[in-house]
């Protein structure tokens, strides 16, 4: 790991994966186990992140890059670089200080994370509710009442299919 000396900075030629070692007259020494340097010219290697507990290793640490963590099943990442793991809830629930709670009436959550959000107010867009909302799903807004006035084309739901071998009563 010896290197040519730079007139500017004796450490500038140390590549990623090494550090400029004071104890060895500023030669480039390899990063020790469980540490890394992702850029050249470093005087230090950074300690590798350890994915412990609720974190699990997504990518091992190397001499040039840090470990990357994700979360064990039942949890999901929060924050830059998965700095925290938060408990999953079911669809139709949100995480509170007291654990997972069902969404209140008029709200929904279609994911295992995040908060319950209010159903869309169809009337604000001048539309009507085509399909009612649930704890897990938002309402589906349909055409506005004006669109259903005489002469206007509308989508009519198909008639229920008849069971074979039966005639209408």
């Amino acid at each position: 790991f010896e290197r040519t000396r730079s007139l500017q900075d004796p450490c500038s030629n140390c590549p990623a994966g090494t550090f400029c070692d004071n104890n060895r007259n500023q030669i480039c020494s390899p990063c020790p186990p469980n540490s890394f340097s992702s850029a050249g010219g470093q005087r230090t290697c950074d300690i590798c992140r350890q994915c412990k507990g609720v974190f699990r290793t997504r990518k091992e640490c190397s001499s040039t890059s840090n470990a990357e963590c994700d979360c064990t099943p039942g949890f999901h990442c929060l924050g830059a670089g998965c700095s925290m793991c938060e408990q999953d809830c079911k669809q139709g629930q949100e995480l509170t200080k007291k654990g997972c709670k069902d969404c209140c009436f008029g709200t929904f959550n279609d994911q295992k994370r995040g908060i319950c959000r209010p159903w869309t107010n169809c009337s604000l867009d001048g539309k009507s509710v085509l399909v009612n909302g649930t704890k897990e799903r938002d309402v589906v807004c349909g055409p506005s009442p004006a669109d259903l006035s005489p002469g206007a084309s509308s989508v009519t739901p198909p008639a229920p299919a008849r069971e074979p071998g039966h005639s209408p009563q």
Epitope: F19, D21, N22, N23, R24, S29, P32, S35, R43, T44, C45, I47
Partner: antibody, heavy 120, light 107 residues
């Protein structure tokens, strides 16, 4: 746990030499720098030099360059510091100390110290 | 050699006080500044390394900050067991050098 155990106190005559030992345990001796630091009575800390036992690479403070020799014996996990041509101002407590992560240059574990008294 | 200076050389404070010690390097040492505590008749102990990183087992009331040439060591709430002499040390350039120390006493 990491331990550095030093040899006992010494009384020496001016002009003589002293050799202080430092036996390491609780970690991989060859993977950490051993430093020697001294402290005269009522004074501050003075870095003398260090050694990397794995390849016996050494650094010395120029102030002691011609008088100090630092060695290491891997088979016994022991480091040594020998100071020659002793004078009264070398009366001090001599510490061996392990340097932790090799790129922060901080000494994380210290021996108990060895008092060297130089007196005629 | 890089010269390290500390101020004050001694100080007296009451239990619970916030205590601050400063350390100055004669040239830029980036963040290669370490702090040690030494009690009478004992070996020094590492408290803080690389300016602000707490050594394992060190109480969180100890902290450090700074960069370049000017550094600060703080005890947020002084405890009776903190009575000691505190030294800064630069790890930027050989030979490694220590400050002259700051003796901390209880009022």
């Amino acid at each position: 746990q990491v331990q550095l155990v030093q040899s006992g106190a010494e009384v020496k005559k001016p002009g003589s030499s002293v050799k202080v030992s430092c036996k390491a345990s609780g970690y991989t001796f060859t993977s950490y720098w051993i430093n020697w630091v001294r402290q005269a009575p009522g004074q501050g800390l003075e870095w003398m030099g260090n050694i990397y036992p794995s390849d016996t690479y050494t650094n010395y403070n120029q102030k002691f360059k011609d008088r100090v020799t630092i060695t290491a014996d891997k088979s016994t996990s022991t480091a040594y510091m020998e100071l020659s041509s002793l004078r009264s101002e070398d009366t001090a407590v001599y510490y061996c100390a392990r340097m932790g992560d090799p790129f922060y240059y901080a000494v994380d574990y210290w021996g108990q110290g060895t008092l060297v008294t130089v007196s005629s | 050699d890089i010269q390290m200076t500390q101020s004050p050389s001694s100080l007296s404070a009451s239990v619970g006080d916030r205590v601050t010690i400063t350390c100055r390097a004669s040239q830029d040492i980036s963040n290669y500044l370490n702090w040690y505590q030494q009690k009478p008749g004992k070996a020094p102990k590492l408290l803080i390394y690389y300016t602000s990183r707490l050594h394992s087992g060190v109480p969180s009331r100890f902290s450090g900050s700074g960069s370049g040439t000017d550094f600060t060591f703080t005890i947020s709430s002084l405890q009776p067991e903190d009575i000691a002499t505190y030294y800064c040390q630069q790890g930027h350039t050989l030979p490694y050098t220590f400050g002259p120390g700051t003796k901390l006493e209880i009022k």
